[in-house]
């Protein structure tokens, strides 16, 4: 009779957990049986992030450090089942920890919006479009941001309106602006659980224009028109 290695109950093992689980939480378990009925000892291999520990007797797997989906998911480690006594034969399977995203990244502007301008004086109210993003994973739909002005004092001069889940329009409420830079604060809410807000600043310059660009003395670059 040839001694056989332990046999895992499944081809691979997977578990889904929220990335913000408390340290010490049971995140999964593996099981194997030995054909000869010997006891089995479980161990982990390749836990490069140092996130997990396994109970050598039960095969239960616990978190031992904070988990971070942005580091890569699923997180894959090898599980080894070794027979205790006998020939100490072992088998290898895999445990995949699927990290479900927690809303932990506030919204931000999708790109650099320096250089926005309107030609002064305004002949009619103007507007510009901007885009928001964040670094969270949006599994079942794209982001659904809402937009508002960052302070009440801005409401006399500006209004912000949502175009879709990622884009909004910033518009002037009148034409009586000074020839200078205005910093418009925008509040972006991601509607997540928990909801996170980012306050971003859009610098908008009102300037004299030459051929559709901000006039600048020699040595200054022209701004780009976004109106």
């Amino acid at each position: 009779d040839v001694n056989e290695a332990p046999q895992f109950s499944q081809h691979v093992f997977q578990a889904k957990v929220s990335e913000d689980v408390a340290i010490g939480t049971k995140v999964g378990n593996v099981t194997a049986k030995d054909p000869e009925g010997l006891d089995i000892s479980y161990s982990l291999r390749g836990d490069t992030r140092g996130w997990l520990k396994i109970d050598h007797v039960t095969g239960e797997i616990f978190s031992v450090a904070p988990l971070d989906r942005e580091a890569g998911s699923p997180y894959r480690v090898q599980v080894v089942a070794t027979e205790v006594g006998g020939s100490s034969l072992s088998s290898v399977s895999e445990f995949h920890l699927i990290l479900m995203d927690v809303n932990d990244n506030p919204p931000r502007l999708a790109k650099d919006y320096t250089g926005l301008f309107f030609c002064h004086p305004l002949s009619a109210p103007g507007s510009l479009i901007f885009e928001a993003t964040d670094d969270d994973q949006h599994l079942f739909r794209g982001p659904h941001f809402t937009f508002s002005l960052g302070s009440g004092s801005l409401q006399n001069d500006w209004e912000v309106s949502k175009i879709n889940g990622t884009h909004a329009r910033l518009s002037t409420r009148h034409t009586e602006f000074e020839e200078r830079e205005y910093v418009v604060l925008i509040r972006i809410n991601d509607g997540g659980r928990p909801p996170l807000e980012g306050i971003v600043s859009l610098p908008v310059t009102f300037c004299s224009c030459v051929e559709g660009s901000c006039f600048r003395p020699a040595g200054h670059k022209h701004h780009h028109h976004h109106h």
């Epitope: 499944q10 081809h11 691979v12 699923p74 599994l139």
Partner: antibody, heavy 116, light 107 residues
Framework: QVQLVQSGAEVKKPGASVKVSCKAS????????MHWMRQAPGQGQEWMGY????????EYNQKFKDRVTMTADKSTSTVYMELSSLRSEDTAVYYC?????????WGQGTLVTVSS | DIQMTQSPSSLSASVGDRVTITCRAS??????LAWYQHKPGKAPKLLLY???VLESGVPSRFSGSGSGTDYTLTISSLQPEDFARYYC?????????FGQGTKLEIK
């Protein structure tokens, strides 16, 4: 980037053997199991087995157990699948695929035609 | 062996339509399920794993649901590039098996 490049099409006579290769690049070869599937004309995908390149452990579908051999060459990051005693119903496209939860990367496929 | 039964075997739909494909396992596979898209002459592409988790780079119009023995792939708004064959596959234990596939065609 991860790539699995398979050997070219083969035409074989019934009773012969075929050996298909799958060269991996762009990742740590020994760290992922490699599976083989096949798809006969007008049929679905059929799993043939897998090899763990780090240990050379193999597990085969019972249907092919007596005819299939999977091997791995770590020095060239290549896995091989040899199927013997070929018959006409073995005519199919054979795929290697890297294992994760499901198969996240596949080779381009190798057409094996068995015809007298 | 665990049998995977996919339905429908073929489906005609238009761009913009919402489409649902179902997959039933002959026993509980505890969400050890993947979905693939396969176009002629190309390698299959992994769409979802663990029944509901979208593979990196796959558009969010694809989603998965289900548990136990019954699973669903949904495409919320069909795009021209989505016309292909779709397969489910379990990886609960060997032998791994696939559904027979659903051919999604343009109406």
């Amino acid at each position: 980037q991860v790539q699995l490049v398979q050997s070219g099409a083969e035409v074989k006579k019934p009773g012969a053997s075929v050996k298909v290769s799958c060269k991996a690049s762009g990742y740590s070869f020994s760290s992922y199991w490699m599976h083989w599937m096949r798809q006969a004309p007008g049929q679905g995908q059929e799993w043939m087995g897998y090899i763990n390149p780090s240990t050379d452990y193999t597990e085969y579908n019972q249907k092919f157990k007596d005819r299939v051999t999977m091997t791995a060459d770590k020095s060239t990051s290549t896995v091989y699948m040899e199927l013997s005693s070929l018959r006409s119903e073995d005519t199919a496209v054979y795929y290697c695929a890297r294992s994760r939860l499901g198969f996240d990367y596949w080779g381009q496929g190798t057409l094996v035609t068995v015809s007298s | 062996d665990i049998q995977m039964t996919q339905s429908p075997s073929s489906l005609s739909a238009s761009v913009g339509d919402r489409v649902t494909i179902t997959c039933r396992a002959s026993e509980n596979i505890d969400s050890y399920l993947a979905w693939y898209q396969h176009k002629p002459g190309k390698a299959p592409k992994l769409l979802l794993y663990a029944a509901t988790v979208l593979e990196s780079g796959v558009p969010s119009r694809f989603s998965g649901s289900g548990s136990g023995t019954d699973y669903t792939l949904t495409i919320s708004s069909l795009q021209p590039e989505d016309f292909a064959r779709y397969y489910c596959q379990h990886y609960y234990r060997t032998p791994l098996t696939f559904g027979q596939g659903t051919k999604l065609e343009i109406k």
